[in-house]
Amino acid sequence: LCQGSNYSTCASCPSCPDRWMKYGNHCYYFSVEEKDWNSSLEFCLARDSHLLVITDNQEMSLLQVFLSEAFCWIGLRNNSGWRWEDGSPLNFSRISSNSFVQTCGAINKNGLQASSCEVPLHWVCKKCPFADQALF
């Protein structure tokens, strides 16, 4: 088990499942296919993970190395303010938006972007390696 885990950290643990990438103390899954935001969330939850919640600028910068111009869904939504799926507010980065219908968050190599939630995009799941209670 990952010991002493919480919403943002995992202890050193075994490697990640197939097709998941280990980075720091977490496993990340970068999808090949595209889904809308809700379907992407469901995909992650079904694999004991969650749509990517980024804890700080450092993690964001590290992840952006693996991203292209193509946007990927992350666990960020605008519900009377931009919040991560763990309930924490977005406070370390700006998100670009141009419309009231853009209430879901995505990321690419250049930063965060709001999008309408029904658009099919790639997505990123995050979890602790193998058996762990933490989702974020």
Partner: antibody
Framework: DVKLVESGGGLVKLGGSLKLSCAAS????????MSWVRQTPEKRLEWVAT????????YYPDTVKGRFTISRDSAKNTLYLQMSSLNSEDTAVYFC???????????????WGQGTSVTVSS | DIQMTQSPSSLSASLGERVSLTCRAS??????LNWLQQEPDGTIKRLIY???SLDSGVPKRFSGSRSGSDYSLTISSLESEDFVYYYC?????????FGAGTKLELK
């Protein structure tokens, strides 16, 4: 040519209900968000509702939330607005309009219908 | 809600004259603004979207610009068919809100 034709307006009693329709042609209806906007007798424009291309997402201002329902039938290329608990402030000309969503960019209200008049009387 | 303060409410001008209408946004709308034209018969047409992009078929005499929270529609040389109503619309934030309108009249 893009064409939007509203119908269903008329005189309705205070507290009554009415359903407006908007027949769309000249574009792929299922690819576009659609909206309803009204114009009061004082010529003020007010946004009423927006629906996504799939119909899964709907958006309303607080003034009509819970009273009005926007819906669409892509097989019939038709947009609807079901209005209930109507009051005098709902008296207006109701326009349907087309919106385009590209995910990260949104083009609001690019084509408009000619409008249908709704009068709420006591 | 974001208030869109449109000015002037009416404007008298001559054929060939250059005029500007302005909408001031009470909060940041990041350029998410359209300009609409309404003819006497009620027909509404979008002229400009996203602050400065001209819709297809709209004459080049129409242009849009931004300075901070002020958004402007400029008509470089007025023609007879331009003497109608104009509205701005912000779509950055819900609810969508419109300016109160400008009536352009022939002097």
């Amino acid at each position: 040519d893009v064409k939007l034709v509203e119908s269903g307006g008329g005189l309705v009693k205070l507290g009554g209900s009415l359903k407006l329709s908007c027949a769309a042609s000249g574009f792929t209806f299922s690819s576009y968000y659609m909206s309803w906007v009204r114009q009061t007798p004082e010529k003020r424009l007010e946004w009423v509702a927006t629906i996504s291309n799939s119909g899964r997402s709907t958006y309303y201002p607080d003034t009509v939330k819970g009273r009005f329902t926007i819906s669409r039938d892509s097989a019939k290329n038709t947009l609807y607005l079901q209005m209930s608990s109507l009051n005098s402030e709902d008296t207006a000309v109701y326009f349907c309009a087309r919106d385009r969503d590209y995910g990260y960019t949104y083009e609001a209200l690019d084509y408009w219908g000619q409008g249908t008049s709704v009068t709420v009387s006591s | 809600d974001i208030q869109m303060t449109q000015s002037p409410s009416s404007l008298s001008a001559s054929l060939g004259e250059r005029v500007s209408l302005t909408c001031r946004a009470s909060q940041d709308i990041g350029g998410s603004l359209n300009w609409l034209q309404q003819e006497p018969d009620g027909t509404i047409k979008r002229l400009i979207y996203a602050t400065s992009s001209l819709d297809s078929g709209v004459p080049k005499r129409f242009s849009g610009s931004r300075s901070g929270s002020d958004y402007s529609l400029t008509i470089s040389s007025l023609e007879s068919e331009d003497f109608v109503y104009y509205y701005c619309l912000q779509y950055a934030s819900s609810p969508l809100t419109f300016g109160a309108g400008t009536k352009l009249e022939l002097k």
